[in-house]
Each structure stands twice: as C-alpha cells, then as structure tokens.
C-alpha cells in the first residue's frame, strides 16, 4: 500500500465534520498512521512528512502541485509540494492553494471555485457506514489518455474534468473518481477552508456552474460556523 | 481480451480459512477498483468487499467485517480476498468484479464456489 | 445500510412484450442506480449505470430511468436472450446493496 508515503498528505488543524451541511454525520473511520480521519469528534494526526512522487498535479493533494523540489532541478524527479498562498508567485493554477488561482503569476483569491483543475473539497457526505476502513489516502486513478475517445457520461470513470462531457466534473466517488453534474443554483455546495482544513476527499461534490458562486445561505448565516448550509448561488 | 478469473474455492470447514485469487488481463488492472461480489446457492447478489486501483483504500459488509481482508498484487495483475473464520452462512460463489469504465461492476469473473460446512 | 426493494420479484412475459422493472431505494440514492442482468451459471452483466447510461454494447432496447429512491429499468421489446433475472444496485454508498432481483420467465 501507499501508507509509507502517505504522510505529505496528513492534515492537520481539521475543524469538526461538515456532514451536517449535506444532512448526514460525519462517519467513524479507522486509518493507517499518516493519515487524519474523522472518527466520531476525535481526529488522528501525525506530524512527520514524507515526499510523495508525481508525475502530475493531479496524483497530489488538494493542498499540493506536483513540482521538482529544486530550482531547475531534474524535470524527472518530481514531488508533491506545498501549495502556495495568496500573493506568492506562481506558473499555474495548481500551484495556488483552494480558493486561489494564478493570475499573472500571482496567487489570487478566488470566490468561484472554477480555477483548480480538480474539486477540492471535505468530508461534506457520510461514509455511510460506520464500519468501513480505510487504509490510506485514495490516491488519483491513473488512467491512459487513450482511454478517452469520447467524453465520460455521467457515472463514467474520469482522471480529470476535461474527461468528462460539457456540465460534469471529475471528482472523488468513494474508490473512484467518476463523472459527476456541475452544481446548479440553489443547490448546496461545498466552500473551501482555510489551508489545511480539507478533509479526506472520498466523496465529492463539483464546482458550482458559470455565473454562480458558492455562498452561505441567507437563512443560515446566524448558525455556528460549523453548520452553515452552502448553495451555489447568483453573483 | 477484458478477462477475469477466479481461483481458490473449496470446501472448508466451519472455523477454517481460505485465499480466493483473481487474476486479470487484458485490462490496466492497476488503474481500477476492484470488488468480491457474492451469491449464496438460489439466492441474490451481495456486495464483500472493494478495493482502490492503489490498494490504499478498503471497504467491507459489515457481514464479513473484521474476518475477511481484501488485497490486490497489482504487479501480479491480481486480487485476492483471505477469508478467515468461515461460517456456514458464507456458502456462496464468488465473484471479482472491476469498475473499469464507471460505477457499475462492468467486468467480472466467472465465480469460485466457496462451501462452507463440516 | 440502504435498502433496495425491487418488484415484482418475478413476472412473465412473452417475446416482444415491454416490460417494466422498478426498483425503490430506502433513502435517495441520487442517481447512483445501476442494472444488471444476470443468466443461470453465469457471472451478472452490466446493463446500465448511473441509472439511465447505457452499458457499451447493451441493446438500446434496456433503458433506465428515475432519480432519488425510485427507479425503473424497461425493455422496450422483450427478446428470447432478455430472460434472466435482473438485480438494481445502488453505489451511493458502502455497502453496497442490490435488490431482491426481478427473475423474467416465458409466458
């Protein structure tokens, strides 16, 4: 398994379970050390890190790019590196970290979640089933490019978004990643944290569609942080 | 050709174990999910167990929690499930199963049927 | 766990008949329904996924439909191979659970 290499994905600081915006709890999990899993209110971290080796943004974490971890080092050895934050420099998109994107090589902030290639996201769904393990991160599924000679379908197995036909996205179905609706207005959503507070992406949602902006419901904005509904609403 | 093939089926007695075996080909088996599937003689289908394409992620029926471990030697192109502390309810053939193009089982295995009886 | 209750538990028909499959779910499920058909001594095969996508190589006769907790798969013109038991799966989430199975005999 990925367990020995699994560290650079380790989370700290992970505010409580969000399963309460989707109407479910969060589900008790066990995991492997290096890795943070909720489980009921108490939360596991492990504090070493570890590099993982990439060939692309993609195998990373939410939090990560796929980059040399030297200037101008060996193009073939590569590693997930910390994302960058906002006004920090930048040469794409997956090198800002949620919320951010890379706008004349400057990570800015960003209120629509478009600009990332994958959906960054929590635990916003419930497990389900309080008895499931989990024996690492789940990694991206690498697929062959050639496998896609016509856009996914909904339900289809997707390595990115551009896989997938016009109005889905690619992102995280439990074991899979598969093709999943852009968010229409009024539906919920998922808004990005702070660095450091995304959650083990099993199950996720896309990004809200164009024109639209993930934002706190208006009738919920006098619940606690932890419960406040998102939807993806009109500009 | 997409193909999946089962091994390691018998008859076992209650308390005992087994390693059931899936070898795959024609397919890049390292990219996939993978499953154990179920049938009990007469009976309808029902879900084991799945495992990430990387082996890193596992889920299990709460019916064969804590007994049966998933696995897979992706430089082997195959899957295995270790079933341990067998009961008799766990009589059945046994599938593999991939999700190889999307969320439905679309390639599987011809089955090993497992008894379980003393 | 998630329930899945599909009816009738069998029916009969005859060649060319339409016939309809349904499938109810214990608490929405979205669209993460698939179908399967599965023969005497053979391993089940995928029809439809994500309740209304059609399986590469399926007939266009299967088709799927529903959203939520109910769902239907229908055979336009039943054909001598349709005979079989169909099964409806949910893959929303673990564990996953199938129907009881809808087993279409000869008339």
């Known amino acids: 398994t990925l367990n020995s290499v699994l560290n650079s994905n380790a989370i700290k600081n992970l505010p409580p379970p969000l399963g309460g915006a989707a109407g479910h709890p969060g589900s008790a999990v066990s995991a492997a050390p290096g890795i943070l899993y909720p489980g009921g209110n108490k939360y596991q971290t492990i504090d070493n890190y570890q590099p993982y080796p990439c060939a692309e943004d993609e195998e990373c974490g939410t939090d990560e790019y796929c980059a040399s971890p030297t200037r101008g080092g060996d193009a073939g050895v590569q590693i997930c590196l910390a994302c960058r934050k906002r006004r920090k420099r930048c040469m794409r998109h997956a090198m800002c970290c949620p919320g951010n994107y890379c706008k004349n090589g400057i990570c800015v902030s960003s209120d629509q979640n478009h600009f990332r290639g994958e959906i960054e996201e929590t635990i916003t769904e419930s497990f389900g089933n309080d008895h499931s393990t989990l024996d690492g991160y789940s990694r991206r599924t690498t697929l062959s490019s050639k496998m896609y000679h016509t856009k996914g379908q909904e339900g289809s197995v997707c390595l990115r978004s551009s896989d997938c036909a016009s109005g889905l996205c690619c992102a995280r179905h439990f074991w899979s990643k598969i093709c999943k609706p852009v968010l229409k207005e009024g539906q919920v959503c998922t808004k990005h944290r702070r660095k450091g507070s995304h959650g083990l992406e099993i199950f996720q949602r896309c990004y809200c569609g164009e024109g639209l902006s993930c934002r706190i419901q208006k009738d919920h904005h006098q619940a606690s942080n932890s419960s406040r509904l998102h939807t993806c609403q009109r500009h | 050709e997409v193909q999946l093939l089962e091994s390691g089926g018998g008859l076992v007695q209650p308390g005992g174990s087994l390693r059931l075996s899936c070898a795959a080909s024609?397919?890049?088996?390292?990219?996939?999910?993978m499953a154990w599937v179920r049938q009990a003689p007469g009976k309808g289908l029902e879900w084991v167990s799945t495992?990430?394409?990387?082996?890193?992620?596992?889920y299990y029926a709460d019916s064969v929690k804590g007994r049966f471990t998933i696995s897979r030697d992706n430089s082997k192109n195959t899957l295995y499930l270790q079933m341990n502390s067998l009961r008799a309810e766990d009589t059945a053939v046994y599938y593999c199963?991939?999700?190889?193009?999307?969320?439905?089982?679309?390639?599987w295995g011809q089955g090993t049927l497992v008894t379980v009886s003393s | 766990d998630i329930q899945m209750t599909q009816s009738p538990s069998s029916l009969s028909a005859s060649v060319g008949d339409r016939v309809t499959i349904t499938c109810r779910a214990s608490?929405?499920?979205?669209?993460?329904l698939n179908w399967y058909q599965q023969k005497p001594g053979k391993a089940p095969k995928l029809l439809i996924y994500?309740?209304?996508s059609l399986q590469t190589g399926v007939p266009s006769r299967f088709s799927g439909s529903g959203s939520g907790t109910d769902f239907t798969l229908t055979i336009s013109s039943l054909q001598p191979e349709d005979f079989a038991t169909y099964y409806c799966?949910?893959?929303?989430?673990?564990?996953?659970?199938f129907g009881g199975g809808t087993k279409v005999e000869i008339k």
């Open positions: 199963a991939g999700h190889r193009s999307n969320i439905g089982w679309d390639v």
């Open positions: 024609g397919f890049s088996f390292s990219s996939f999910a």
């Open positions: 495992i990430s394409g990387s082996g890193d992620v596992t």
């Open positions: 608490q929405t499920i979205r669209t993460y």
């Open positions: 994500a309740t209304s």
């Open positions: 799966q949910q893959s929303y989430r673990p564990p996953l659970t």
